[in-house]
Protein backbone atom coordinates (compact mmCIF):
# COMPACT_ATOMS: atom_id res chain seq x y z
CA UNK A 1 0.00 0.00 0.00
CA UNK A 2 1.25 3.40 -0.79
CA UNK A 3 0.31 6.78 0.59
CA UNK A 4 -0.88 9.08 -1.79
CA UNK A 5 -1.94 12.59 -1.65
CA UNK A 6 -6.10 13.64 -2.65
CA UNK A 7 -6.38 15.66 -5.44
CA UNK A 8 -9.16 18.78 -5.04
CA UNK A 9 -10.21 21.65 -6.98
CA UNK A 10 -10.44 24.72 -4.47
CA UNK A 11 -13.05 27.69 -4.60
CA UNK A 12 -14.30 29.66 -2.32
CA UNK A 13 -18.23 31.23 -1.80
CA UNK A 14 -17.66 33.48 -4.48
CA UNK A 15 -16.81 31.41 -6.90
CA UNK A 16 -12.69 32.28 -7.39
CA UNK A 17 -10.53 29.14 -8.11
CA UNK A 18 -6.87 29.37 -7.11
CA UNK A 19 -4.64 30.39 -10.07
CA UNK A 20 -0.84 29.72 -10.24
CA UNK A 21 0.50 32.92 -11.60
CA UNK A 22 4.31 32.64 -11.44
CA UNK A 23 5.62 31.08 -8.22
CA UNK A 24 2.57 32.71 -6.47
CA UNK A 25 -1.16 32.05 -5.79
CA UNK A 26 -3.75 34.24 -6.22
CA UNK A 27 -7.66 34.23 -6.47
CA UNK A 28 -9.63 34.19 -9.57
CA UNK A 29 -13.07 33.77 -10.64
CA UNK A 30 -13.90 30.31 -11.86
CA UNK A 31 -13.73 30.62 -15.93
CA UNK A 32 -13.06 29.51 -18.98
CA UNK A 33 -10.09 32.07 -19.29
CA UNK A 34 -8.15 30.86 -16.77
CA UNK A 35 -6.95 27.25 -15.31
CA UNK A 36 -7.06 26.50 -11.54
CA UNK A 37 -4.83 24.28 -9.56
CA UNK A 38 -5.83 21.14 -8.41
CA UNK A 39 -4.71 20.94 -4.84
CA UNK A 40 -2.73 18.05 -3.31
CA UNK A 41 -3.73 16.81 0.50
CA UNK A 42 -2.18 14.74 2.20
CA UNK A 43 -2.49 13.34 5.93
CA UNK A 44 1.53 14.14 8.29
CA UNK A 45 2.18 11.02 9.97
CA UNK A 46 4.02 13.02 12.82
CA UNK A 47 1.33 13.35 15.58
CA UNK A 48 3.40 15.94 17.49
CA UNK A 49 1.34 19.29 16.81
CA UNK A 50 -2.07 17.22 16.68
CA UNK A 51 -5.43 18.80 18.02
CA UNK A 52 -8.38 17.12 16.67
CA UNK A 53 -10.34 20.44 17.62
CA UNK A 54 -8.48 22.44 15.13
CA UNK A 55 -8.86 19.53 12.43
CA UNK A 56 -6.46 17.54 11.03
CA UNK A 57 -2.64 17.82 10.38
CA UNK A 58 -2.19 18.52 6.33
CA UNK A 59 0.06 19.38 4.16
CA UNK A 60 -1.03 21.22 1.00
CA UNK A 61 0.54 21.11 -2.34
CA UNK A 62 -0.21 21.48 -5.87
CA UNK A 63 -0.61 19.07 -8.00
CA UNK A 64 2.13 18.56 -11.00
CA UNK A 65 4.50 21.20 -9.49
CA UNK A 66 7.36 20.46 -6.59
CA UNK A 67 5.23 23.41 -4.77
CA UNK A 68 3.66 23.54 -1.19
CA UNK A 69 2.19 25.91 0.80
CA UNK A 70 4.24 26.74 4.04
CA UNK A 71 3.97 30.07 6.71
CA UNK A 72 6.75 32.09 7.54
CA UNK A 73 7.06 35.13 9.33
CA UNK A 74 7.87 38.17 6.98
CA UNK A 75 8.45 41.69 8.74
CA UNK A 76 6.78 40.61 11.48
CA UNK A 77 3.68 39.45 9.98
CA UNK A 78 2.77 35.58 9.04
CA UNK A 79 2.49 35.03 5.39
CA UNK A 80 1.51 31.92 3.27
CA UNK A 81 4.22 31.07 0.81
CA UNK A 82 5.05 28.67 -2.22
CA UNK A 83 8.55 26.66 -1.46
CA UNK A 84 9.90 24.12 -4.08
CA UNK A 85 9.15 20.78 -2.44
CA UNK A 86 7.76 17.76 -3.29
CA UNK A 87 4.67 16.69 -0.90
CA UNK A 88 5.93 13.21 -0.52
CA UNK A 89 9.01 14.17 0.68
CA UNK A 90 7.23 15.95 3.76
CA UNK A 91 4.69 13.08 3.98
CA UNK A 92 8.00 10.89 4.40
CA UNK A 93 9.96 12.56 6.99
CA UNK A 94 9.56 11.24 10.36
CA UNK A 95 9.46 14.70 12.25
CA UNK A 96 6.29 16.64 11.50
CA UNK A 97 7.68 19.97 9.25
CA UNK A 98 5.46 22.80 11.37
CA UNK A 99 5.64 25.60 8.64
CA UNK A 100 4.07 23.64 6.34
CA UNK A 101 1.09 22.14 8.35
CA UNK A 102 -1.96 23.18 8.24
CA UNK A 103 -4.84 22.28 10.58
CA UNK A 104 -8.12 20.85 7.75
CA UNK A 105 -11.53 21.55 10.17
CA UNK A 106 -14.69 21.18 7.73
CA UNK A 107 -17.48 23.78 8.81
CA UNK A 108 -20.60 22.39 6.96
CA UNK A 109 -19.77 21.28 3.67
CA UNK A 110 -16.79 23.94 3.37
CA UNK A 111 -13.19 23.38 5.02
CA UNK A 112 -10.87 26.27 6.70
CA UNK A 113 -7.12 25.86 6.97
CA UNK A 114 -5.38 26.98 9.58
CA UNK A 115 -1.41 27.82 10.07
CA UNK A 116 -0.03 25.17 12.91
CA UNK A 117 3.20 27.72 12.95
CA UNK A 118 0.43 30.76 13.57
CA UNK A 119 -2.52 29.78 15.28
CA UNK A 120 -5.57 31.62 14.81
CA UNK A 121 -3.97 32.69 10.93
CA UNK A 122 -5.97 31.41 8.18
CA UNK A 123 -5.51 30.66 4.48
CA UNK A 124 -8.29 33.43 3.12
CA UNK A 125 -8.79 35.24 -0.32
CA UNK A 126 -9.71 38.53 -0.69
CA UNK A 127 -13.20 39.25 -1.75
CA UNK A 128 -11.21 41.21 -4.99
CA UNK A 129 -10.06 38.83 -7.89
CA UNK A 130 -6.18 39.01 -8.58
CA UNK A 131 -4.82 39.00 -5.28
CA UNK A 132 -2.92 36.74 -4.06
CA UNK A 133 -3.96 33.73 -0.99
CA UNK A 134 -2.88 35.06 2.19
CA UNK A 135 -2.98 34.21 5.74
CA UNK A 136 -5.52 36.55 8.24
CA UNK A 137 -7.10 36.74 11.26
CA UNK A 138 -10.41 38.42 10.18
CA UNK A 139 -12.03 36.18 9.08
CA UNK A 140 -16.02 37.49 7.79
CA UNK A 141 -17.28 39.18 5.00
CA UNK A 142 -14.34 40.86 3.67
CA UNK A 143 -12.00 38.12 3.86
CA UNK A 144 -13.12 34.75 2.80
CA UNK A 145 -11.53 32.02 4.81
CA UNK A 146 -13.78 29.16 4.00
CA UNK A 147 -13.09 26.89 1.04
CA UNK A 148 -15.15 24.15 -0.92
CA UNK A 149 -13.28 20.88 -1.98
CA UNK A 150 -14.08 19.73 -5.14
CA UNK A 151 -12.96 15.98 -5.78
CA UNK A 152 -10.84 15.99 -9.33
CA UNK A 153 -10.36 11.63 -8.77
CA UNK A 154 -13.41 9.61 -9.33
CA UNK A 155 -16.41 12.15 -9.46
CA UNK A 156 -19.61 10.98 -11.47
CA UNK A 157 -17.67 11.26 -14.85
CA UNK A 158 -16.82 14.93 -13.91
CA UNK A 159 -14.32 15.56 -16.31
CA UNK A 160 -12.07 17.44 -14.31
CA UNK A 161 -8.59 16.44 -15.29
CA UNK A 162 -9.09 16.62 -19.19
CA UNK A 163 -10.94 20.10 -18.41
CA UNK A 164 -7.48 21.32 -16.51
CA UNK A 165 -5.02 19.73 -18.60
CA UNK A 166 -6.62 21.71 -21.29
CA UNK A 167 -5.24 24.67 -22.49
CA UNK A 168 -6.02 28.00 -20.79
CA UNK A 169 -4.06 31.26 -20.21
CA UNK A 170 -2.70 32.01 -17.67
CA UNK A 171 -4.39 34.48 -14.85
CA UNK A 172 -3.46 38.22 -15.61
CA UNK A 173 -5.00 41.34 -14.23
CA UNK B 1 -28.97 11.87 -21.07
CA UNK B 2 -29.86 13.92 -18.21
CA UNK B 3 -33.17 15.56 -17.88
CA UNK B 4 -35.36 17.41 -15.14
CA UNK B 5 -38.82 17.77 -14.68
CA UNK B 6 -40.43 20.34 -12.48
CA UNK B 7 -43.57 19.10 -10.45
CA UNK B 8 -45.96 21.21 -8.04
CA UNK B 9 -49.39 22.61 -7.40
CA UNK B 10 -50.08 25.10 -10.39
CA UNK B 11 -52.44 27.30 -7.56
CA UNK B 12 -51.39 28.98 -4.36
CA UNK B 13 -53.21 31.06 -2.86
CA UNK B 14 -51.56 34.30 -1.19
CA UNK B 15 -49.55 34.57 1.76
CA UNK B 16 -49.22 30.66 1.37
CA UNK B 17 -45.74 28.86 0.45
CA UNK B 18 -44.60 27.47 -2.94
CA UNK B 19 -43.63 24.27 -3.16
CA UNK B 20 -41.99 22.60 -6.03
CA UNK B 21 -39.85 19.41 -6.87
CA UNK B 22 -37.42 18.76 -9.42
CA UNK B 23 -36.48 15.37 -10.18
CA UNK B 24 -33.79 14.50 -12.00
CA UNK B 25 -33.00 11.35 -14.38
CA UNK B 26 -30.49 10.17 -16.22
CA UNK B 27 -27.83 11.59 -14.05
CA UNK B 28 -27.29 11.23 -9.90
CA UNK B 29 -27.70 14.37 -7.80
CA UNK B 30 -24.79 14.06 -6.12
CA UNK B 31 -22.76 14.34 -9.02
CA UNK B 32 -19.13 15.84 -8.38
CA UNK B 33 -18.68 19.24 -9.07
CA UNK B 34 -22.28 19.88 -10.08
CA UNK B 35 -24.96 22.56 -8.95
CA UNK B 36 -28.32 22.88 -9.20
CA UNK B 37 -31.01 25.87 -9.74
CA UNK B 38 -34.20 27.52 -9.49
CA UNK B 39 -35.12 30.05 -12.25
CA UNK B 40 -38.81 31.47 -13.02
CA UNK B 41 -40.15 33.37 -15.25
CA UNK B 42 -43.26 36.10 -14.51
CA UNK B 43 -46.08 36.03 -17.72
CA UNK B 44 -44.30 38.05 -20.57
CA UNK B 45 -41.08 39.00 -18.39
CA UNK B 46 -37.60 37.96 -18.15
CA UNK B 47 -35.52 34.92 -16.43
CA UNK B 48 -34.78 35.62 -12.61
CA UNK B 49 -32.43 33.73 -10.81
CA UNK B 50 -34.07 32.65 -7.75
CA UNK B 51 -31.23 30.18 -5.94
CA UNK B 52 -29.26 26.73 -6.09
CA UNK B 53 -27.94 24.24 -4.22
CA UNK B 54 -24.49 22.09 -5.08
CA UNK B 55 -23.81 18.77 -4.77
CA UNK B 56 -21.97 19.95 -1.57
CA UNK B 57 -25.30 20.62 0.17
CA UNK B 58 -24.13 24.62 -0.63
CA UNK B 59 -26.98 27.14 -1.04
CA UNK B 60 -26.95 30.47 -2.81
CA UNK B 61 -29.75 32.63 -2.66
CA UNK B 62 -31.34 35.56 -4.67
CA UNK B 63 -30.45 38.74 -2.41
CA UNK B 64 -33.82 39.40 -3.27
CA UNK B 65 -35.79 36.73 -2.33
CA UNK B 66 -33.73 35.70 0.35
CA UNK B 67 -35.76 35.51 3.63
CA UNK B 68 -38.60 33.78 1.79
CA UNK B 69 -36.50 31.10 -0.04
CA UNK B 70 -35.52 27.56 0.60
CA UNK B 71 -34.00 25.05 -1.94
CA UNK B 72 -33.16 21.57 -1.08
CA UNK B 73 -32.18 17.95 -1.99
CA UNK B 74 -33.40 14.87 -1.21
CA UNK B 75 -30.80 11.86 -2.30
CA UNK B 76 -33.16 9.33 -2.15
CA UNK B 77 -35.34 10.49 -4.51
CA UNK B 78 -32.89 12.26 -6.89
CA UNK B 79 -34.92 15.14 -6.42
CA UNK B 80 -34.28 19.04 -5.34
CA UNK B 81 -36.94 20.99 -3.82
CA UNK B 82 -37.63 24.75 -3.64
CA UNK B 83 -39.81 26.31 -1.07
CA UNK B 84 -41.04 30.31 -1.44
CA UNK B 85 -43.07 31.40 1.30
CA UNK B 86 -45.32 34.33 1.99
CA UNK B 87 -46.44 34.51 -2.24
CA UNK B 88 -48.28 36.98 -3.65
CA UNK B 89 -49.53 37.86 -7.02
CA UNK B 90 -45.89 39.05 -8.57
CA UNK B 91 -44.46 35.16 -7.80
CA UNK B 92 -46.72 34.51 -10.52
CA UNK B 93 -44.07 32.72 -13.14
CA UNK B 94 -43.00 29.95 -15.17
CA UNK B 95 -40.80 28.04 -12.18
CA UNK B 96 -37.57 26.28 -14.13
CA UNK B 97 -35.24 24.02 -12.65
CA UNK B 98 -31.82 24.10 -14.11
CA UNK B 99 -28.04 22.72 -13.94
CA UNK B 100 -24.78 22.73 -14.72
CA UNK B 101 -20.76 22.16 -13.61
CA UNK B 102 -18.47 24.20 -11.98
CA UNK B 103 -15.42 23.30 -14.23
CA UNK B 104 -17.20 22.28 -17.34
CA UNK B 105 -19.75 25.07 -17.67
CA UNK B 106 -18.22 27.39 -15.79
CA UNK B 107 -20.92 29.02 -13.48
CA UNK B 108 -23.51 28.38 -16.83
CA UNK B 109 -26.94 25.97 -16.73
CA UNK B 110 -26.54 23.67 -19.72
CA UNK B 111 -29.80 21.85 -18.79
CA UNK B 112 -33.29 22.69 -17.94
CA UNK B 113 -36.65 21.61 -17.04
CA UNK B 114 -39.85 22.38 -19.36
CA UNK B 115 -41.07 24.55 -16.91
CA UNK B 116 -44.56 25.20 -14.71
CA UNK B 117 -46.55 27.92 -14.75
CA UNK B 118 -47.37 28.57 -10.96
CA UNK B 119 -50.55 31.14 -10.68
CA UNK B 120 -50.92 32.89 -7.13
CA UNK B 121 -54.68 33.68 -7.01
CA UNK B 122 -57.12 33.38 -3.82
CA UNK C 1 -34.08 46.38 -13.08
CA UNK C 2 -31.75 43.50 -14.47
CA UNK C 3 -27.98 43.39 -13.11
CA UNK C 4 -27.15 42.95 -17.29
CA UNK C 5 -28.71 45.14 -19.33
CA UNK C 6 -29.80 43.83 -22.95
CA UNK C 7 -31.42 45.51 -25.66
CA UNK C 8 -35.35 44.95 -25.51
CA UNK C 9 -35.28 44.27 -29.10
CA UNK C 10 -33.44 43.92 -32.51
CA UNK C 11 -34.23 43.13 -35.77
CA UNK C 12 -32.95 41.84 -39.01
CA UNK C 13 -33.77 40.54 -42.48
CA UNK C 14 -33.06 36.65 -43.55
CA UNK C 15 -29.24 36.46 -44.44
CA UNK C 16 -28.20 39.38 -41.97
CA UNK C 17 -26.01 39.63 -39.21
CA UNK C 18 -27.46 41.02 -36.08
CA UNK C 19 -25.66 41.71 -32.54
CA UNK C 20 -27.18 41.76 -28.80
CA UNK C 21 -25.18 43.26 -26.26
CA UNK C 22 -25.09 43.03 -22.73
CA UNK C 23 -23.59 45.09 -19.76
CA UNK C 24 -22.94 44.48 -16.67
CA UNK C 25 -20.35 46.26 -14.53
CA UNK C 26 -16.86 45.23 -11.95
CA UNK C 27 -18.80 42.40 -10.02
CA UNK C 28 -20.04 40.64 -12.76
CA UNK C 29 -18.58 40.62 -16.16
CA UNK C 30 -16.07 42.87 -15.20
CA UNK C 31 -14.71 41.06 -12.54
CA UNK C 32 -13.82 38.31 -15.21
CA UNK C 33 -17.01 35.98 -14.84
CA UNK C 34 -17.68 34.23 -17.67
CA UNK C 35 -21.18 35.14 -19.65
CA UNK C 36 -23.61 32.77 -20.87
CA UNK C 37 -26.35 33.05 -23.82
CA UNK C 38 -29.60 31.19 -24.19
CA UNK C 39 -31.91 31.22 -26.46
CA UNK C 40 -35.98 30.95 -25.36
CA UNK C 41 -38.19 29.88 -28.59
CA UNK C 42 -41.92 30.67 -28.31
CA UNK C 43 -43.29 28.53 -25.49
CA UNK C 44 -39.94 26.47 -24.56
CA UNK C 45 -37.93 26.24 -21.87
CA UNK C 46 -34.56 28.63 -22.53
CA UNK C 47 -31.70 26.66 -24.29
CA UNK C 48 -28.06 26.68 -23.59
CA UNK C 49 -26.83 28.75 -26.98
CA UNK C 50 -23.07 29.96 -25.85
CA UNK C 51 -21.56 29.10 -22.56
CA UNK C 52 -18.15 30.41 -21.09
CA UNK C 53 -18.09 33.67 -23.29
CA UNK C 54 -17.42 32.10 -26.82
CA UNK C 55 -17.76 28.42 -26.53
CA UNK C 56 -20.62 26.49 -28.64
CA UNK C 57 -22.82 23.12 -26.82
CA UNK C 58 -22.47 20.68 -29.18
CA UNK C 59 -25.46 21.19 -31.71
CA UNK C 60 -25.39 24.63 -32.15
CA UNK C 61 -24.53 26.06 -35.70
CA UNK C 62 -21.78 28.34 -36.06
CA UNK C 63 -23.84 31.21 -37.12
CA UNK C 64 -24.18 31.79 -33.44
CA UNK C 65 -21.32 33.31 -31.93
CA UNK C 66 -19.98 35.42 -28.49
CA UNK C 67 -17.69 37.70 -26.93
CA UNK C 68 -16.50 39.28 -24.37
CA UNK C 69 -14.60 42.40 -23.54
CA UNK C 70 -14.41 44.65 -20.27
CA UNK C 71 -17.44 44.89 -18.38
CA UNK C 72 -20.08 44.04 -21.69
CA UNK C 73 -20.48 41.17 -24.17
CA UNK C 74 -22.12 40.23 -27.11
CA UNK C 75 -23.86 37.61 -29.22
CA UNK C 76 -23.66 37.79 -32.36
CA UNK C 77 -25.70 35.60 -35.03
CA UNK C 78 -24.71 35.78 -38.96
CA UNK C 79 -26.82 34.29 -42.10
CA UNK C 80 -29.94 35.42 -39.94
CA UNK C 81 -33.01 32.43 -40.70
CA UNK C 82 -36.70 32.47 -39.39
CA UNK C 83 -36.38 29.72 -36.77
CA UNK C 84 -33.60 32.50 -34.78
CA UNK C 85 -36.89 34.08 -33.87
CA UNK C 86 -36.93 33.92 -29.99
CA UNK C 87 -35.62 35.73 -26.81
CA UNK C 88 -31.74 35.93 -25.79
CA UNK C 89 -30.70 36.09 -22.55
CA UNK C 90 -27.07 36.79 -20.94
CA UNK C 91 -26.11 35.23 -17.71
CA UNK C 92 -22.87 35.47 -15.58
CA UNK C 93 -22.09 35.15 -12.19
CA UNK C 94 -21.94 38.54 -9.62
CA UNK C 95 -19.95 38.20 -7.01
CA UNK C 96 -21.27 40.79 -4.57
CA UNK C 97 -24.76 39.21 -4.75
CA UNK C 98 -23.30 35.74 -4.29
CA UNK C 99 -25.31 34.41 -7.34
CA UNK C 100 -26.10 33.91 -11.27
CA UNK C 101 -27.17 37.02 -12.77
CA UNK C 102 -29.49 37.28 -16.27
CA UNK C 103 -30.42 40.05 -18.58
CA UNK C 104 -33.56 41.41 -19.64
CA UNK C 105 -34.15 39.41 -22.46
CA UNK C 106 -33.93 40.80 -25.97
CA UNK C 107 -36.45 39.76 -28.38
CA UNK C 108 -35.32 38.83 -31.98
CA UNK C 109 -37.65 39.91 -34.96
CA UNK C 110 -36.69 38.21 -38.31
CA UNK C 111 -38.44 40.52 -40.89
CA UNK C 112 -40.13 39.77 -44.20
Known amino acids: WQAAPKSYAIRDSRQMVWVLSGNSLIAAPLSNRVKPVTLHLITCRDTEFSDKKKGNLVYLGIRGKDLCLFCEEIQGKPTLQLKEKNIMDLYMEKKAQKPFLFFHNKEGSSSVFQSVSYPGWFIATSSTSGQPIFLTQERGITNNTNFYLDSVEGGGGSGLNDIFEAQKIEWHE | ELQLQESGPGLVKPSETLSLTCTVS??????????WGWIRQPPGKGLEWIGS???????YYNPSLKSRVTISVDTSKNQFSLKLSSVTAADTAVYYCATGKYYETYLGFDVWGQGTLVTVSS | ESVLTQPPSVSGAPGQRVTISCTGS?????????VHWYQQLPGTAPKLLIY???NRPSGVPDRFSGSKSGTSASLAITGLQAEDEADYYC???????????FGGGTKLTVLG
Open chain 3, 91 to 101: QSYDYSLSGYV
Open chain 3, 52 to 54: GND
Open chain 3, 26 to 34: SSNIGAHYD
Open chain 2, 26 to 35: GGSITASNTY
Open chain 2, 53 to 59: IDYTGST
